[in-house]
């Protein structure tokens, strides 16, 4: 028998520095977690103690904090190189700055192979990107070889900016021939490493013949055997065992997100490459694990540029950006409109001639808007200003909801109106009329939404049974501010870009902004 230790991360999302327990900015260092310096300590400890160790990443290193905004992926390559990762799969967010923003910062600068079997380049890009990412890589581990085959969510064109010259194929269809190829090369231990979410990970384990282990990402899935060490609730045991169609027991793992845990899986193979046993658990990277001093020093060196960036002008406003709770928790506020407009702008994807865009709607809890921005400071808007407006380090995500769920959400928005509560929704691509004289749960008297399957966008009444795409904060997607109906009834949820980054990019693009209060949210009394 031959034993392999798989260490794995996924959806790190730019958390290079240690964070608080909820993966936001670290405030009290003695209670902070994660970060590459702490990760390195644990990885090195395991490498010294065990003979056959692979360190793998299942994608979405890009996007999430000011580190990515400033360094654009160079920080990912630098610190992953320093940790000596063995391989990485491409995630959807690796395409956030287009293909050019992936090639030089990461693909060419990484010292490790970057993988995806289901992304195929065409046209002029094919020659430019040839060999920069691979469908699979055979890695020598001790006296054996292990094949790693990569995959990426086929939804990436809707979630990021891969352009028109990359085709995202069905994962299972694309993986099978690559695994077959590895078999012909006499590679009998094969790991599928990828970024398509837990449901797809399980399908790959079930359907792709020859895959021995699946290491996934995208869905931020937390798996754990025994009593979990922090706040995350396990979605199942670690590893999650899937019985394949050909009768094998295939372990599937994921390690939550944000570098809070290091996945730790021990696999025992027989001489023919069959999995005999698998066990392990994610390791919580809490403050009991010291930060490596040399990596920490490097982090501090790279940090300097971030502090300078925070005070640079992104653009100008010529109007007061009203982000006060007195406005945003009671009525339409222009800060809410600005943020929603930025959210939609960030999700412009012309993927189908029938649609001017795949999504037109935005909702945003007024309680998430934490500060106004005064235009009387020469109109200057900085990252620092935006960090005061959006201090929670959230993301703006894409969900699919039925009209009936949206209607419930808008009823919830005003069910206890007047108490300055955070659930009052700011909107984009939506016209809503409330009648507060009616009883809670029956106050939405008009709800019109902007069409997407149209060449000239216009507002049509919401249809209860229709499925709509909506951009909203991850806080709402997770049922925050009492929006349990969103969490319970959403049909799809894909995590998006860092909230501040979305707004800062929009302001930089527009250069000068002047958002108005324009009648997106109205109040009426009496008949309609």
């Amino acid at each position: 028998a031959w034993e392999l230790t798989i260490l794995h991360t996924n959806d790190v999302h730019s958390r290079l520095e240690q964070t608080s327990e909820d993966s936001s900015k670290c405030v009290n260092a003695s209670r902070c977690m994660g970060g590459v310096a702490r990760l390195f300590t644990k990885v090195q400890q395991i490498r010294r103690a065990e003979p056959n160790v692979l360190l793998l990443d299942a994608g979405d290193q890009y996007q999430g904090t000011i580190w990515f905004t400033v360094y654009k992926g160079a920080e990912v390559a630098h610190f992953m190189n320093a940790l000596r990762y063995d391989a990485m799969a491409l995630g959807n967010h690796e395409f956030d700055n287009g293909v050019e923003g992936l090639i030089e910062p990461l693909l060419k600068e990484a010292k490790f192979p970057i993988l995806s079997a289901n992304i195929k380049a065409k046209g002029p890009l094919a020659s430019q990107i040839s060999g920069l990412y691979l469908p699979y890589k055979v890695l020598p581990v001790g006296d054996e070889v292990v094949g790693i085959v990569g995959y990426t969510s086929k939804e990436t064109p809707f979630l990021s900016n891969p352009g028109t010259n990359l085709v995202f194929e069905d994962e299972i269809t694309a993986l099978q021939p690559e695994v077959d190829k590895l078999k012909t090369l006499n590679v009998n231990k094969i790991i599928a490493l990828g970024h398509s979410g837990f449901e797809m990970d399980k399908l790959i384990a079930q359907k792709v013949r020859g895959v021995d282990v699946v290491v996934g990402g995208h869905s931020n899935t937390f798996l754990y055997t025994g009593n979990p060490p922090s706040k995350e609730v396990p979605a199942g045991k670690y590893p999650f065992i899937v019985t394949s169609d050909d009768g094998r027991k295939v372990p599937v793992v994921q390690a939550y997100a944000f570098g809070k845990y290091l996945g730790y899986l021990k696999i025992e193979f027989d001489e023919r490459g069959n999995v005999i046993s698998s066990h392990g658990n994610p390791i919580l990277l809490n403050s009991s694990i010291p930060e490596d001093p040399s990596i920490k020093a490097d982090i501090n060196k790279w940090r300097i540029k971030l502090d300078n960036y925070s005070t640079q002008e992104l653009g100008k406003t010529i109007v007061y950006l009203d982000g006060s709770s007195q406005s945003c928790r009671f009525r339409e506020c222009n800060m809410g409109n600005l943020i929603c407009d930025a959210m939609i702008n960030n999700n412009l994807r012309h993927t189908d001639e029938m649609f001017w865009n795949h999504v037109s709607m935005c909702i945003l809890n007024g309680g998430g808007i934490r500060s106004p921005i005064d235009e009387r400071n020469n109109g200057t808007i900085t990252w620092e200003n935006l960090a005061a407006v959006l201090p929670f380090g959230g993301t703006f995500d894409l969900v699919q909801l039925k009209g009936s769920t949206l209607k419930k959400a808008f009823e919830h928005s005003v069910h206890r109106y007047g108490q300055s509560t955070g659930e009052f929704l700011q909107v984009g691509g939506i016209h809503v009329v409330y009648d507060l004289s009616r009883k809670p749960g029956d106050r939405v008297v008009k709800l019109d939404v902007l069409c997407t399957k149209c060449r000239v966008p216009s507002y049509d009444p919401l249809k209860m049974d229709e499925v709509y795409k909506v951009i909203l904060p991850n806080f709402l997607a997770n049922g925050g501010d009492g929006f349990q109906m969103i969490k319970d009834e959403l049909l799809r949820h894909d995590s998006g870009d860092q909230d501040i980054n979305v707004v800062s990019t929009y302001i930089s693009k527009m250069k000068v902004i002047y958002p108005a209060v324009e009648g997106r949210i109205k109040f009426s009394t009496g008949s309609h």
């Epitope: 050019e100 090639i103 030089e104 060419k108 010292k111 430019q128 020598p140």
Partner: antibody, heavy 119, light 107 residues
Framework: QVQLVQSGAEVKKPGSSVKVSCKFS????????FSWVRQAPGQGLEWMGR????????DYAQKFRDRVTITADESTSTAYMELSGLRSEDTAVYYC????????????WGRGALITVSS | DIQMTQSPSFLSASVGDRVTITCQAS??????LNWYQQKPGKAPKLLIY???SLETGVPSRFSGSGSGTSFTLTISSLQPEDFATYYC?????????FGGGTKVDIK
Amino acid sequence: QVQLVQSGAEVKKPGSSVKVSCKFSGGSFTSYSFSWVRQAPGQGLEWMGRIIPVLTTTDYAQKFRDRVTITADESTSTAYMELSGLRSEDTAVYYCASGLKKNWYFDLWGRGALITVSS
Amino acid sequence: DIQMTQSPSFLSASVGDRVTITCQASQDISHYLNWYQQKPGKAPKLLIYDASSLETGVPSRFSGSGSGTSFTLTISSLQPEDFATYYCQQYDDFPLTFGGGTKVDIK
């Protein structure tokens, strides 16, 4: 196909500066990094530094940090290496090199420029 | 800086010989090592990257092995066109450093 064309040989006086150019063609300039490697007559290879134009980042060998400046001009797809305070031991062939697949291995080289430092 | 020590510095061999060149790193560099061939008056040519991966178009008689601090370039059957100088290069850390070179000439 992708290639690097370097400027020609030069003779320089001690204490002066030299600026060697490396013109890139046949691909997307922003998808590459450019390293400078020198080789004194009958000696081995010595890496001086590099630039990643799209990120405007440079890395230099400590030995040359005070005297070398590597720059790039995206409009002409050209990388430059300027070495100041020349001395006789700087007489060498100066190569510009790049990687087609990774920035860490050089599968693309210019023909080299012989810089002779002599009074 | 990481020191790369190549041995031997000079090597005389005949066509058809099996030739082995070693490269020692002053610290662990994992598999972050490349091999180049250089002929007089020409730029170096990449042969092997990542310690053991054969560059496209390079004959299969060239192979590389090793990890950590000890690396080897092997030419299984020396051909007339292989008489040249060979360099190893580490890319574990800046500055990138080369070995002193091994000159292979005709016995």
